[in-house]
Amino acid sequence: SASSRRRQQSRNRSTQSQDVARVSSASDYNSSELKTACRKHELYVSFQDLGWQDWIIAPKGYAANYCDGECSFPLNAHMNATNHAIVQTLVHLMNPEYVPKPCCAPTKLNAISVLYFDDNSNVILKKYRNMVVRACGCH
Amino acid sequence: SASSRRRQQSRNRSTQSQDVARVSSASDYNSSELKTACRKHELYVSFQDLGWQDWIIAPKGYAANYCDGECSFPLNAHMNATNHAIVQTLVHLMNPEYVPKPCCAPTKLNAISVLYFDDNSNVILKKYRNMVVRACGCH
């Protein structure tokens, strides 16, 4: 059905402009130009925007990035797909209603160091794992 | 807009019945009963259904499972969210148009052994990594 197609095809957001993305008809969700393959997108996160400026001293923000895009058949080599994702893609192809496509998720994540105040206003320098997306893949 | 809400909320398919899932209006996509949290779902994959029965000798199929569900704020401990996913959830909360929610993906995968014919009709026993979903999380 149109709804199930839309549901599956919209699992990964388009990287088109917001104006294009706002178009709401099912045909637009199906249009091939709206969908790009799973990849890393740049994203800078400001701790001030998150409301964390009162307890994070440094950095003021960081390049977090994010993963987005389609995990559709066939899964190319650059999509870093797992064997399970390949199988799931085939199952989805046979029965889109039953199983979703694999999703575009981080495959490599890096840490960042954060200087912050703890609950007692002591200053802590801590390495936070898995904060920066380095690579994406279909999972 | 309705389209952006639908796009974000449908990134992770509902586990409700297909009949419910077929309802296509935006309001249904927004309904809370349609969305369940990210978790592992059972899925048995038959190699015959995939058309692989001619080259895979054994097993005839396997419990592959798959991941599906919402990665919405707040991310609970059982969602096995990475630090990046927590940050991304907050950024999405602030600006749903700009960044998608994290997606529900495998966090633990197991291997299976497969007995199959190679291109020269030799029988090979090989361990295929990352074939079975053991756990899911928000990534």
Epitope: Q53, D54, I57, A58, P59, F117, S121, N122, V123 | -
Partner: antibody
């Protein structure tokens, strides 16, 4: 190069409120944390508190109930108010910058030249 | 709070001599978050050392810092006439930020 200049009344009556301002030149107040430190005559140094330009503050618990530090980004200034002063609050009051990055935190550099505030009737 | 105890209270030395100043913390100072300052009469303190051992910009290399945990030392390898002053240690890892009582280095 960054310079800090304290200003305010040199004499405050007991039980009144001490008010001082630190004007920052040569740098944006938005880049660092900013602190007040005091030194009673002939004695050691005591940290009063610090502020980030967004308004978040941290105070010395021994003074917290009487102290307010605020910031005015438009004027590149931050201020100290200390209520219910007594003779024990007589001191040279310094403002200072706190470096605040991953590799640099918590030390005071540079300092203002200091201003003597005497609490007396 | 972390109490910093400096010793000796006064150090009487001649120019050219080596000065060793001690700063002992009542509990461990995290990440060696300790600084040393020099203060001359009528002047504001001046940063010498941060991070227990890193020299601040423009500070002569005769000044050096060492130590970790609870015991820290400021060493002036060869005293110059302008080095006679009061020296303070400060910890900035725990709240409240605290200073030692100071060591006065005077001319013998």
């Amino acid at each position: 190069q960054v310079q800090l200049q304290e200003s305010g009344p040199g004499l405050v009556k007991p039980s009144e409120t001490l008010s001082l301002t630190c004007t920052v030149s040569g740098d944006s107040i938005r880049s660092y944390y900013w602190s007040w430190i005091r030194q009673p005559p002939g004695k050691g140094l005591e940290w009063i508190g610090y502020i980030y330009y967004r308004g978040s503050t941290h105070y010395n618990p021994s003074l917290k109930s009487r102290v307010t530090i605020s910031v005015d980004t438009s004027k590149n200034q931050f201020s100290l108010k200390m209520s219910s002063v007594t003779a024990a609050d007589t001191a040279v009051y310094y403002c200072a910058r706190i470096c605040s990055s991953i590799s640099c935190w918590g030390w005071f550099d540079p300092w203002g030249q200091g201003t003597l505030v005497t609490v007396s009737s | 709070e972390i109490v910093l105890t400096q010793s000796p209270g006064t150090l009487s030395l001649s120019p050219g001599e080596r000065a060793t100043l001690s700063c002992r913390a009542s509990q461990s100072v995290s990440s060696s978050y300790l600084a040393w300052y020099q203060q001359k009469p009528g002047q504001a303190p001046r940063l010498l050392i941060y991070g227990a051992s890193s020299r601040a910009t423009g500070i002569p290399d005769r000044f050096s810092g060492s130590g970790s945990g609870t015991d820290f030392t400021l060493t002036i390898s060869r005293l110059e006439p302008e080095d006679f002053a009061v020296y303070y240690c400060q910890q900035y890892g725990s709240s409240p930020l605290t200073f030692g009582g100071g060591t006065k280095v005077e001319i013998k």
